[in-house]
């Protein structure tokens, strides 16, 4: 058993049929010694008396808010949560496996630039009685500070018969140099509590590996005289690290119709303009990627050909 | 310790091309190592990230773009003195700071070159003959060093009398290649910045 936060405790249980469970001793936070009784949740049934209560925690029915009272007055609370371990593996029932970039990916994180600011998100099908808390650091043995905000519900989607909820959190490394060469990864730890179930999820990464620039901005077309070719130009996104001559991007320019199966014109360039062949009912799209360290491409920025 | 804006004229910067070749060569070599040594811990997640130039050179700090010198997190107090007479400095106006930067890059390359050559000598003794260093990568390191053209004491190649542990050598190769790729990215960024200034 360990303390998650004040008056909230996590009991780690090996979860299998007829498991013996864990013996837990609760102590009432009071100077009083006599006349103390214990109850669980909203029940008025007295579980025991005395300053301490010893319980055998085996299942979710044994978890919950234990309260010690004296003469009708509440003295203190202890909330017991369960953390299940099945076949030596901690449960991951609360969050959905996103399976990208590999299986057992519950947290996904992205950074728009090298400033040390990043966003992580996760998915769940649970809509109520759900809380998250997020901690982060650079390295684990001698951790350096990363400050994370509160996790918020950022999107709701319908997937078949199920509703899916996306939560996200923004974090900022306390003293980040955009030009630094990372040797210690960022560690992100998410505590998830659903009703009386506790789970924790972690992710470890270098900012350089989670870079995904914003799409290029200000796409403009200039038809070339006596030609089907069009000069397309754009600018670096505002959120990208500066100076751009140091933090350079490379671009992919594509002309394609509405369907992905349609024919296309595609060219890669380090410049902020390119010449392509425009077709009726097609769109010109441009996306960006760090020129020197190939992490993710940005989303496409698009303009119609016409 | 930073790069001022007054740097060589565009197109007068021979090191840019060499640095691009360097990044390409080390990236290819790393990819080859990851494929060939698939049963060794050779991915970024599996290895320890070590920097053999730590406390010996200070390339990131010495080559910091002017715009980042206002960022206190970027200003490290490490001081290192370097020799200053390079042929990539294609302009007389080139500052002492830029000379420090290019000299630091040269020292990085020299250290990695020695490590890679020592390692290759060990890998050539491996009866499995599983992996060797790409001669192209070694040649590209050499070309960039020649373009930088700094006079510096030659570092003797480390010779080891004990029987090499090939497993450890291959893991060390992965560690070295990951670190060198990160440094090659920094070098490429620096050369691009200098070329544009």
């Amino acid at each position: 058993i360990w303390e998650l936060k004040k008056d909230v405790y996590v009991v780690e249980l090996d979860w299998y049929p007829d498991a013996p469970g864990e013996m837990v001793v609760l102590t009432c936070d009071t100077p009083e010694e006599d006349g103390i009784t214990w109850t669980l949740d909203q029940s008025s049934e007295v579980l025991g008396s005395g300053k301490t209560l010893t319980i055998q925690v085996k299942e979710f029915g044994d978890a919950g808010q234990y309260t010690c009272h004296k003469g009708g007055e509440v003295l203190s609370h202890s909330l017991l949560l369960l953390h299940k371990k099945e076949d030596g593996i901690w449960s991951t029932d609360i969050l959905k496996d996103q399976k990208e970039p590999k299986n057992k990916t519950f947290l996904r994180c992205e950074a728009k630039n090298y400033s040390g600011r990043f966003t992580c998100w996760w998915l769940t099908t649970i809509s109520t009685d759900l809380t998250f808390s997020v901690k982060s650091s650079r390295g684990s043995s001698d951790p350096q500070g990363v400050t994370c905000g509160a996790a918020t519900l950022s999107a709701e989607r319908v997937r078949g018969d199920n509703k899916e909820y996306e939560y996200s959190v923004e974090c900022q490394e306390d003293s980040a140099c955009p030009a630094a060469e990372e040797s210690l990864p960022i560690e992100v730890m998410v505590d998830a509590v659903h009703k009386l179930k506790y789970e924790n999820y972690t992710s470890s990464f270098f900012i350089r590996d989670i870079i995904k620039p914003d799409p290029p901005k200000n796409l403009q077309l200039k038809p070339l005289k006596n030609s089907r070719q069009v000069e397309v130009s754009w600018e670096y996104p505002d959120t990208w690290s500066t100076p751009h001559s140091y933090f350079s991007l490379t671009f992919c320019v594509q002309v394609q119709g509405k369907s992905k199966r349609e024919k296309k014109d595609r060219v890669f360039t380090d410049k902020t303009s390119a010449t392509v062949i425009c077709r009726k009912n097609a769109s010109i799209s441009v996306r960006a990627q760090d020129r020197y360290y190939s992490s993710s491409w940005s989303e496409w920025a698009s303009v119609p050909c016409s | 310790r930073n790069l001022p804006v007054a740097t060589p004229d565009p197109g007068m910067f021979p090191c840019l091309h060499h640095s691009q070749n360097l990044l390409r060569a080390v990236s290819n070599m790393l990819q080859k190592a990851r494929q060939t040594l698939e049963f060794y811990p050779c991915t970024s997640e599996e290895i320890d990230h070590e920097d053999i130039t730590k406390d010996k050179t200070s390339t990131v700090e010495a080559c910091l773009p002017l715009e980042l010198t206002k960022n206190e997190s970027c200003l490290n107090s490490r001081e290192t003195s370097f020799i200053t007479n390079g042929s990539c400095l294609a302009s007389r106006k080139t500052s002492f700071m830029m000379a420090l930067c290019l000299s630091s890059i040269y020292e990085d390359l020299k250290m990695y070159q020695v490590e890679f050559k020592t390692m290759n000598a060990k890998l050539l003794m491996d009866p499995k003959r599983q992996i060797f260093l790409d001669q192209n990568m070694l040649a590209v390191i050499d070309e960039l060093m020649q373009a930088l053209n700094f006079n510096s004491e030659t570092v003797p190649q480390k010779s080891s009398l004990e029987e090499p542990d090939f497993y450890k050598t291959k893991i060390k190769l992965c560690i070295l290649l990951h670190a060198f790729r990160i440094r090659a990215v920094t070098i490429d960024r620096v050369m691009s910045y200098l070329n544009a200034s």
Epitope: T250, E262, K263, K264, D265, F268, I277 | -
Partner: antibody, heavy 118, light 107 residues
Framework: QVQLVQSGAEVKKPGSSVKVSCKAS????????LHWSRQAPGQGLEWMGW????????EYAPKFQGRVTITADESTSTAYMELSSLRSEDTAVYYC???????????WGQGTLVTVSS | DIVMTQSPLSLPVTPGEPASISCRAS??????LHWYQQKPGQAPRQLIA???QSISGVPSRFSGSGSGTDFTLTISSLQPEDFATYYC?????????FGQGTKVEIK
């Protein structure tokens, strides 16, 4: 299976024209760009131009501009390349080729040898 | 027009050994570079797209690298069926242009 079948070999006199055909099968004809390239005996490849069969748009290499015409007939899934004012140096194997990507080629025809000789 | 220069023009290789062919562009073409293989009396066959993207059905011993002006096609271990002529082609701008070709011959 995408296939491009070209017309047979031709012998032409200098100053005349030649029209080579290329019939496509497998896949929708207008879903692909069609290119023509050529290869003189013992020499390398030389790109001549492309056509978008969907709208008839074409682009020619400046070297052949004014001498080459590429057309396409959607009803028969056939593309044509006509080269006029033939010279002996136009002796080559002419290839039609196609791709959904405009700027490179994934499927080639078997080639048509055009010999220009007096 | 962008001029593509291949080297060497002839490359004698022992079967089972690796081979590397270089292609240089007269100006920077990013990764807009493609590789083809051609055997005598046959049409070319695509090997690599955009400098390093492998093509389905092409053996994994063929790999490409490079960007800007310098590109390399590598065959990790030459098989008897790999003895052929190899061409690079730029797609950065029209007109599309090919290298002169590199003939890989049995040593």
């Amino acid at each position: 299976q995408v296939q491009l079948v070209q017309s047979g070999a031709e012998v032409k006199k200098p100053g005349s024209s030649v029209k080579v055909s290329c019939k496509a099968s497998g896949g929708t004809f207008s879903d692909y760009y069609l290119h023509w390239s050529r290869q003189a005996p013992g020499q390398g490849l030389e790109w001549m131009g492309w056509i978008d069969p969907e709208n008839g748009d074409t682009e020619y290499a400046p070297k052949f501009q004014g001498r080459v015409t590429i057309t396409a007939d959607e009803s028969t899934s056939t593309a044509y390349m006509e080269l006029s004012s033939l010279r002996s140096e136009d002796t080559a194997v002419y290839y039609c080729a196609r791709n959904k990507e405009l700027r490179y080629i994934d499927v080639w025809g078997q080639g048509t040898l055009v010999t220009v000789s007096s | 027009d962008i001029v593509m220069t291949q080297s060497p023009l002839s490359l004698p290789v022992t079967p089972g050994e690796p081979a590397s062919i270089s292609c240089r562009a007269s100006q920077s073409i990013s990764i807009n570079l493609h590789w083809y293989q051609q055997k005598p009396g046959q049409a070319p066959r695509q090997l690599i797209a955009f400098a390093s993207q492998s093509i389905s059905g092409v053996p994994s011993r063929f790999s490409g690298s490079g960007s800007g002006t310098d590109f390399t096609l590598t065959i990790s271990s030459l098989q008897p069926e790999d003895f052929a002529t190899y061409y690079c082609q730029q797609s950065n701008s029209f007109p599309l242009t090919f290298g002169q070709g590199t003939k890989v011959e049995i040593k």
